[in-house]
């Protein structure tokens, strides 16, 4: 996994100090990655919370800075950075020493094989005359007298170390300050030297330039600064990165980082720099991390302190010991990838003197299998064969080589191959949106198999045809909009996803079914009349036009502005050209208008109108209660409606028959402060009914109904009459 | 050939009153909404007013509430804006145009106008 | 009420060019939409109506798309004859508003 964490020992300030993580993954922060995480790892050493919170600042997915220390015992212990995803996730350690600590490493990072013996070995930066105590992960494991120190140093001595050796060492002045230890790490790699796998049955490709081979997969862990299958190539000065594609930031290059990678690697300065502030310069004769490799170069070549032997024409190798006469396999890339059950021709190129020829270029596989080239071309400075390689499976995955020998000697150069299976989705697409002819489609799915996507094609058809699929290509990164569709239809919806390369295209994945929207409603209604049926009803009436009609129902929309509320009435009914609305707050300002729907779908709203519906009246009169005085008369007594909604203007009175069939006739009391009425000129011996409301700005609700019968033997009349103080009046009929 | 043309427009002064008339023709006249929409001199495309087949349904811009009334006599064929308290931002020329019949997408008939000034 | 906004208010283009105008509804007006183009002292005309659909004798260069709140009208490769003012205006809701309109010039 090339992740990378960087930290910048010439800041001594913690409040300028941070720690850098840079993931140079290959689709490193696809939105399904988990993200990068940076942070203090307290579980061993353990110091004072910080005075103020970390922060954590990303550039893009794939790099992480975490800064806001406040004082220099924030930055002591351990940080770690974790990234990559599913089983590839890793973690790298970094382990900050404080640079006025009691005791300081000779080297913090130590990387052994199993069975090796390790020394750590700390040395004396302020005197303390008390014992010093080693622990192992936070617990006791040693103490040495003060006095045992050798040369201004305390050493301690593991034998024999095996895998649970591994972790963080300390080295502490008794009764001192933690943060005045000595932090170290010990990596011991699961296998003995230059083996790896199951078993350590495996050979380590030979890592060269101090890369570490990788217990589990027998990669090369390269220092910062080298690159390939066995970190035989030098980045350009400040550059780092499993490719150099990673630049060292400002203007001194990579003087003064700490570079931390994966296990079993560890930490080390930059190519090129050593010391524990990684501020010196290598030695002449010097080079690589931590300077700790040496030139040696032979036949004129010439010491960089970056990439080692700068050879002379006519030579080559890692100390210009090779001739240009032995043959030389040239340039050929470190790494290649195909994907699974493709048959890729794979080239090697050869020089030197005698010319290679067709049967002495070979391709080694994994599995030990040699292959003979099929065809070579010959140029005047090159031999290249061609060899066609059997349908790959991933069995073929690993380190194959091409070897070239002949009379003037031999080379090989191994390369790694990476089979690769084609992505296939596991969920179908997603719908974003949809209209009456278009849907509008994420074509992001989660998939098996390898990543990079290079391009997503979705197949579209409508549900249950048979019809061949309409296929689009489209931008994985991008939402797809899917157009010409028909109305109101279901369609199948399926993902192919390709990675790059000959043979990248996966199997289909699941398909969705999608569903068209309904053609929109275009046709906009008119209001034709409406009409206050009381102080909380009101009918409405609307129109369309004569064409034809696609709708459902319609949508009554009434807002009431001073309450800032709106009011739906939905009509379910597309015939539908009336409406009564029923429970409206009375005495309210309505703006009303009609709209046609069609499935979800609102046509065009009608011009809206405005109505007023008027406020409610008062409550009924109270205790209502009738006697009959004559053959004629019938006085009514009640008392005033319990708190009416304002000064009552005048009360009305229902007269009707009983059992009669005639409309009822009503008289006003316009005074509004009595509460009786003799009521004149009734009918003999005649059973009547009788109620009351009052009025305020409306007309109030109706009392209870009262019965009562004249007395027998008088004249017939004409029609009841009210008695007034001052002149008699009529019904209103 | 549907036709509409615009009359009634001139100089009057501010909080004068005015109306404005739009003969239609070349179609059933009683079937189709109205509109009025006008444009001040240099400036863009303000709508005014609708009226529906009828009559009964009618509707305004904010800016000309309570001061215009739009009204129609289907027997004359004939679109009305009674425009009152008339203001110098009201100087426009005036068009009417036909509603497209229940369908709201779009005026493909306009008369040619009718300029209306407030000025004192 | 629904407020309509065009951008650019004026643009300059080269004929042949493909020129692109956009039409901004406060809220959402479904595919209620209409484009119209007047030039200087003419009557507007209609050219796209609901939002996407070519009036009948506009030629094809011209086209309108979108839904919602985001609109276009474009102008494929533009002609002399297509200086004027381009006017968007929405049917959603009464009072029918319209854009402030976009003026277009031949460079």
């Known amino acids: 996994v090339d992740l990378t964490l960087l930290a910048n020992l010439r800041i001594t300030d913690p409040q300028r100090f941070f720690l850098t993580c840079v993931s140079g993954e290959a689709g490193a922060g696809r939105s399904s990655d988990p993200p990068l995480l940076l942070e203090k790892d307290d579980r061993i050493v353990r110091t004072f919370p910080p005075g103020q919170p970390l922060y954590l600042a990303r550039n893009g997915s794939h790099q992480v800075t975490l800064r806001g220390f406040s004082k220099p015992s924030d930055l002591v212990g351990v940080f770690s950075c974790v990234g990559g995803a599913g089983a590839r996730r890793t973690r790298v350690l970094y382990v900050h020493n404080s640079p006025g600590a009691h005791l300081f490493p000779d080297k913090v990072t130590h990387t052994v094989n199993k069975g090796d013996t390790a020394v750590l070995s700390a040395h004396v930066h302020k005197e303390k005359q008390t014992d010093v105590i080693w622990k192992n992960n936070g617990s006791y494991f040693n103490t040495l007298d003060w006095q045992e120190a050798d040369d201004g140093r305390f050493q301690l001595q593991l034998q024999n170390v095996q895998p649970p050796s591994s972790g963080i060492y300390s080295a502490t002045y008794l009764e001192a300050s933690p943060l005045g230890s000595a932090f170290f790490r010990l990596i011991v790699r699961g296998c003995g030297a230059g083996r790896w796998g199951p078993g350590c049955v495996k050979d380590c490709p030979g890592c060269l330039h101090g890369g570490v081979c990788h217990d589990h997969d027998g990669e090369c862990v390269c220092p910062p600064g080298f690159t390939g299958t066995r970190c035989e190539q030098a980045c350009r000065e400040g550059r780092f990165g499993q490719s150099c594609q990673e630049q060292c930031p400002g203007t001194a290059g990579c003087r003064g980082l700490t570079f931390c990678l994966p296990d079993p690697y560890g930490c080390s300065c930059g190519s090129g720099w050593r010391g524990s502030q990684c501020q010196e310069a290598c030695a002449p004769g010097h080079f690589g991390a931590d300077c700790r490799l040496q030139c040696q170069c032979q036949n004129g070549g010439t010491c960089d302190r970056f990439s080692g032997c700068v050879c002379p024409s006519g030579w080559h190798g890692v100390h210009c010991e090779k001739s240009d006469r032995i043959p030389q396999i040239l340039s050929m890339a470190t790494e290649v990838e195909f994907n699974i059950g493709t048959m890729p021709r794979i080239n090697c190129a050869a020089a030197g003197n005698p010319f290679p020829v067709r049967g002495s270029m070979k391709l080694r596989k994994p599995d030990g299998t040699m292959l003979l080239s099929t065809k070579v071309i010959v140029e005047p400075d090159r031999t290249t064969a061609e060899f066609e390689v059997p349908s790959l499976t991933l069995g073929d995955s690993g380190f194959w080589e091409c070897r070239v020998s002949t009379s003037g000697g031999q080379d090989s150069r191994r390369f790694k191959v990476n089979v690769k299976v084609p992505p296939v989705p596991l969920t179908a697409p997603r719908l974003l949106a949809k209209q009456s002819r278009q849907l509008v489609v994420s074509p992001l799915v989660s998939f098996s198999g390898d990543g990079p996507i290079s391009s997503v094609r979705l197949h579209y058809r409508p549900q249950d045809s048979t019809i061949a699929w309409s296929a689009i290509v489209v931008d994985p990164s991008e939402n797809v909009t899917l157009m010409n569709l028909k109305p109101k239809t279901g369609y199948n919806v399926r993902v192919q996803l390709s990675r790059p390369g000959e043979g990248g295209e996966g199997g289909w994945g699941p398909s969705a079914l999608m569903t068209t929207d309904c053609p929109e409603p275009l046709l906009q209604p008119w209001l034709e009349s409406w009409h206050v049926e009381g102080p909380d009803r009101l009918r409405v009436s609307w129109s369309l036009p004569s064409v034809p009609l696609s709708g459902d129902g319609f949508l009554l929309r009434l807002w009431d502005g001073a309450r800032g509320q709106e009011r739906r009435e939905n009509i379910s009914f597309p015939q539908a050209r009336t409406a009564l609305l029923t429970g409206l707050t009375p005495g309210t300002h309505y703006q009303l208008d009609v709209r046609l729907y069609h499935c979800t779908l609102l046509g065009p709203a009608s011009p809206p109108a405005h109505v007023h519906l008027p406020p409610s009246g008062p409550p009924a009169p109270r205790h209502l209660h009738a006697q009959a005085l004559s053959d004629s008369e019938i006085q009514l007594m009640w008392q005033h409606p319990e708190a009416p909604s304002g000064p009552i203007s005048k009360y009305i009175v229902e007269i009707q028959v009983a059992g009669g069939s005639g409309d009822p006739q009503w008289m006003d009391v316009d005074r509004p402060e009595e509460t009786s009425i003799i009521v004149r000129g009734l009918n003999a011996s005649t059973r009547y009914l009788f109620r009351v409301r009052a009025s305020v700005q409306g007309l109030g609700d109706w009392s209870n109904t009262v019965e009562e019968a004249t007395l027998g033997n008088g004249l017939q009349s004409e029609g009841p009459v009210r008695e007034s103080r001052a002149a008699e009046e009529g019904l209103d009929q | 050939e549907v036709q509409l043309l615009e009359s009634g427009g001139g100089l009057v002064q501010p909080g004068g009153s005015l109306r404005l008339s739009c003969a239609a023709s070349g179609f059933t006249f009683s079937m189709y909404g109205m509109v009025w929409v006008r444009q001040a001199p240099g400036k863009g495309l303000e709508w005014v007013s609708v009226i529906s087949p009828s009559g009964g349904n009618t509707g305004y811009a904010d800016s000309v509430k309570g001061r215009f009334t739009i009204s129609r006599d289907n027997s004359k064929n004939t679109l009305y804006l009674q425009m009152n308290s008339l203001r110098a931002e009201d100087t426009a020329v005036y068009y009417c145009?036909?509603?497209?019949?229940?369908?709201?997408?779009?005026?493909?008939?306009w008369g040619q106008g009718t300029l209306v000034t407030v000025s004192s | 009420d629904i407020q309509m906004t065009q951008s650019p208010s004026s643009l300059s283009a080269s004929v042949g060019d493909r020129v692109t105008i956009t039409c901004r509804a406060s809220q959402g007006i479904g595919h209620y939409l209409a484009w119209y183009q007047q030039k200087p002292g003419k009557v507007p005309k209609l050219l796209i109506y609901t939002a996407s659909t070519l009036q009948s004798g506009v030629p094809s260069r011209f086209s309108g798309s979108g839904s919602g709140t985001d609109f276009t009208l474009t102008i494929s490769s533009l002609q002399p004859e297509d200086v004027a003012t381009y006017y968007c205006q929405q049917f959603n809701s009464y009072p029918h508003t319209f854009g402030q309109g976009t003026r277009l010039e031949i460079k």
């Open positions: 145009a036909r509603a497209p019949r229940g369908y709201s997408y779009g005026y493909y008939y």
